[in-house]
Amino acid sequence: RTTTCFGDGCQNTASRCKNGGTWDGLKCQCPNLYYGELCEEVVSSIDIGPPETISAQMELTVTVTSVKFTEELKNHSSQEFQEFKQTFTEQMNIVYSGIPEYVGVNITKLRLGSVVVEHDVLLRTKYTPEYKTVLDNATEVVKEKITKVTTQQIMINDICSDMMCFNTTGTQVQNITVTQYDPEEDCRKMAKEYGDYFVVEYRDQKPYCISPCEPGFSVSKNCNLGKCQMSLSGPQCLCVTTETHWYSGETCNQGTQKSLVYGHHHHHH
């Protein structure tokens, strides 16, 4: 948020940028939370996303029996490791085909025991408020598919007739991590010292991080003819003075007619 300044007063403005604003030669460049000529005003809404996609990571272990472990497989930059990675990835892409959330696999470690493959299965889905359910379902299908393939693709008489064969009992799901998206937490963090006064409200399933100074929401503060301004003690109404009236009160709803004051009378409406 930027406000441009022209003329002789600009040099003075430069040293007066507030709230961490920086002078760029023309104007105060304000940090995210502030705006105004001197970055003196607090914004009334903060963009908190949501992210376009949400990811999940499943830590799995499978035992490949159709490949004998060799020392070279410990070295991730060896040709042997690269070839194993390629074949394993191709095999897993076949196993998990049909899972729209499936992104790929990432081998973290290969160790002895035929070849024990510690790896992550990566999942991703478009953000919707139901993303947790979508990813929970996908992780269940991953478990089903890997269990099925490691039961079916097995060595017979020490020979494998598939791209890879597995040890049925060597399949384990260690851990499942879903990227947490917490709009309330994000809102509080991004509002910094004003966090107590910003809340999340939903519109068309999209979260909005707003202060009561943002109009059009259930928490919005009605300042009538005044202006809502955020301070460290919360939202306050700054009341205006017109040619004919002074306005006062917490929501600037009390108007005092100037002519009556000058005539030493008070009239409220």
């Epitope: 029996t65 490949v67 042997e80 390629q86 074949t87 494998c160």
Partner: nanobody
């Protein structure tokens, strides 16, 4: 870069013999697995035999006792000695290799391939 060159194919009468060879360049000959596959017209490529770096061998049931796979690590060469050939052995024969110690006869597990050499067995 690994390159495989198969040769030795030809036409032979039923009961005859052929010796196929496969020269490997850029392949660490003392490691991994080398194999022979074949493909008859209109059929899938099938594993014939493979040999590991330690000399362990395995054969398809249909060729056991008739075919012998061997490799010379010093010469980086793979061979397939085929005896008592039958008309059903007819097809294009390919050599394949993997840097891994494999125990599979599935073609998808082998990343390196030579061009084929044709074997025709007539009755």
């Amino acid at each position: 870069d690994v390159q495989l060159q198969a040769s030795g194919g030809g036409s032979v009468q039923s009961g005859g013999s052929l010796r196929l060879s496969c020269a490997a360049s850029g392949f660490p000959s003392s490691r991994g697995t080398m194999a022979w596959f074949r493909q008859a017209p209109g059929r899938e490529r099938e594993g014939v035999a493979f040999i590991n770096s330690d000399g362990r061998t395995s054969y398809a049931e249909s060729v056991k006792g008739r075919f012998t796979i061997s490799r010379d690590n010093a010469l980086s060469t793979l061979w397939l000695q085929m005896n008592s050939l039958k008309p059903e052995d007819t097809g294009m024969y390919y050599c394949a290799a993997s840097l891994l110690y494999l125990m599979t006869v599935n073609a998808a597990a082998y990343p390196y391939w030579g061009q084929g050499t044709q074997v025709t067995v007539s009755s």
